[in-house]
């Protein structure tokens, strides 16, 4: 049940982050940490790295406040569930400083990505006989 | 705003091969998943199949043995295949983006295949 | 796989009217369910995402509510662009099924 709430919530971040991507433009081009390529079971740590990341408006504009809010829903903390703390003890996963910095575009995409994939996870593990490959 | 365009033969003769291609535009498929659904005359939909940009796909099991789908980043198209195909794979075919894994936000209008010696 | 039952299969209605429409799962699908809008000729739109997030660029005059096994649809007050095919979508497991739909008719 938890766990189910925490992937509708990361359906409805993929939204917010699609709605960012239509204002890179008005985004300030710092190079953030994007994890890639996530390991399994490291994937709320990953999380975490992107929400930490500084994502910033320009100030330039009409679209500063709806970029700074979808920025704040994308910061909201998820609740916690057993999957989340049982990840957040593994010290072998990388620290948010050793992914690669992206310009905010990549950044987003590579969000996007991992928010998808933790979904299709959690889609599969529900399910027999349907993954081909 | 991404667009999607099937394309194929919209006749196909029994135990043949059905081959349809989605054309993307408005965006890159080189993110996101990218599906098949079906409507046959007067009934409702079914979900063939995706693809991901990464190329892992899912299946309907009902048309398993039957489905490949893939994927061309290059021309920025994917692609349906159904083997074997009888009368009852008559259907309307739509291709689908889906940004949210399990739903779909953007469609194709559709291409009329109908199965017929 | 998850049955979906939508109801009723049709219903008339007139400008300004409200109206809902119903869909209900076989099994538990939590918030996953979709809906969408289907006019002949056209592609399908999506209108809802997990039971109740409106899709960016839809009118708020559309909106949805349930969980578990049971699900609505409203649309609060039905405009002449309204009349069309809705349909359910369960987005909980494979295979992703469909309802039957459900057909809005000018009354």
């Known amino acids: 049940q938890g766990q189910d709430r925490h992937m509708i919530r990361m359906r409805q971040l993929i939204d917010i982050v699609d709605q960012l991507k239509n204002y890179v433009n008005d985004l300030v081009p710092e190079f953030l940490p994007a994890p890639e390529d996530v390991e399994t079971n490291c994937e709320w740590s990953a999380f975490s790295c992107f929400q930490k990341a500084q994502l910033k408006s320009a100030n330039t504009g009409n679209n500063e406040r709806i970029i700074n809010v979808s920025i704040k829903k994308l910061k909201r903390k998820p609740p916690s569930t057993n999957a989340g703390r049982r990840q957040k003890h593994r010290l072998t996963c990388p620290s948010c400083d050793s992914y690669e910095k992206k310009p905010p575009k990549e950044f987003l995409e590579r969000f996007k990505s991992l928010l998808q994939k933790m979904i299709h996870q959690h889609l599969s593990s529900r399910t027999h006989g349907s993954e081909d490959s | 705003q991404v667009q999607l365009q099937e394309s194929g033969p919209g006749l196909v003769k029994p135990s043949e091969t059905l081959s349809l291609t989605c054309t993307v535009s408005g965006g890159s498929i080189s993110s996101d998943y990218w599906g098949w659904i079906r409507q046959p005359p007067g009934k409702g939909l079914e979900w063939i199949g995706y693809i991901s940009s990464s190329g892992s796909t899912n299946y309907n099991p009902s048309l398993k043995s039957r489905v490949t789908i893939s994927v061309d980043t290059s021309r920025n198209q994917f692609s349906l295949k159904l083997s074997s195909v009888t009368a009852a794979d008559t259907a309307v075919y739509y291709c689908?983006?889906?940004?949210?894994?399990?739903?779909?936000?953007?469609w194709g209008q559709g291409t009329l295949v109908t199965v017929s010696s | 796989d998850i049955q979906l039952t939508q109801s009723p299969s049709s219903v008339s209605a007139s400008v300004g009217d409200r109206v809902t429409i119903t869909c209900r799962a076989s099994?538990?699908?939590?918030?996953?369910l979709a809906w969408y809008q289907h006019k002949p000729g056209k592609a399908p739109k999506l209108l809802i995402y997990?039971?109740?997030s409106l899709q960016s660029g839809v009118p708020s005059r559309f909106s949805g509510s349930g969980s578990g096994t049971d699900f609505t649809l409203t649309i609060s007050s039905l405009q002449p662009e309204d009349f069309a095919t809705y349909y359910c979508?369960?987005?909980?497991?494979?295979?992703?099924?469909f309802g039957g739909g459900t057909k809005v008719e000018i009354k």
């Open positions: 979508q369960q987005a909980s497991s494979f295979p992703l099924t």
């Open positions: 689908a983006r889906s940004a949210g894994v399990a739903d779909f936000d953007f």
């Open positions: 099994q538990g699908i939590s918030s996953w």
């Open positions: 997990v039971a109740s």
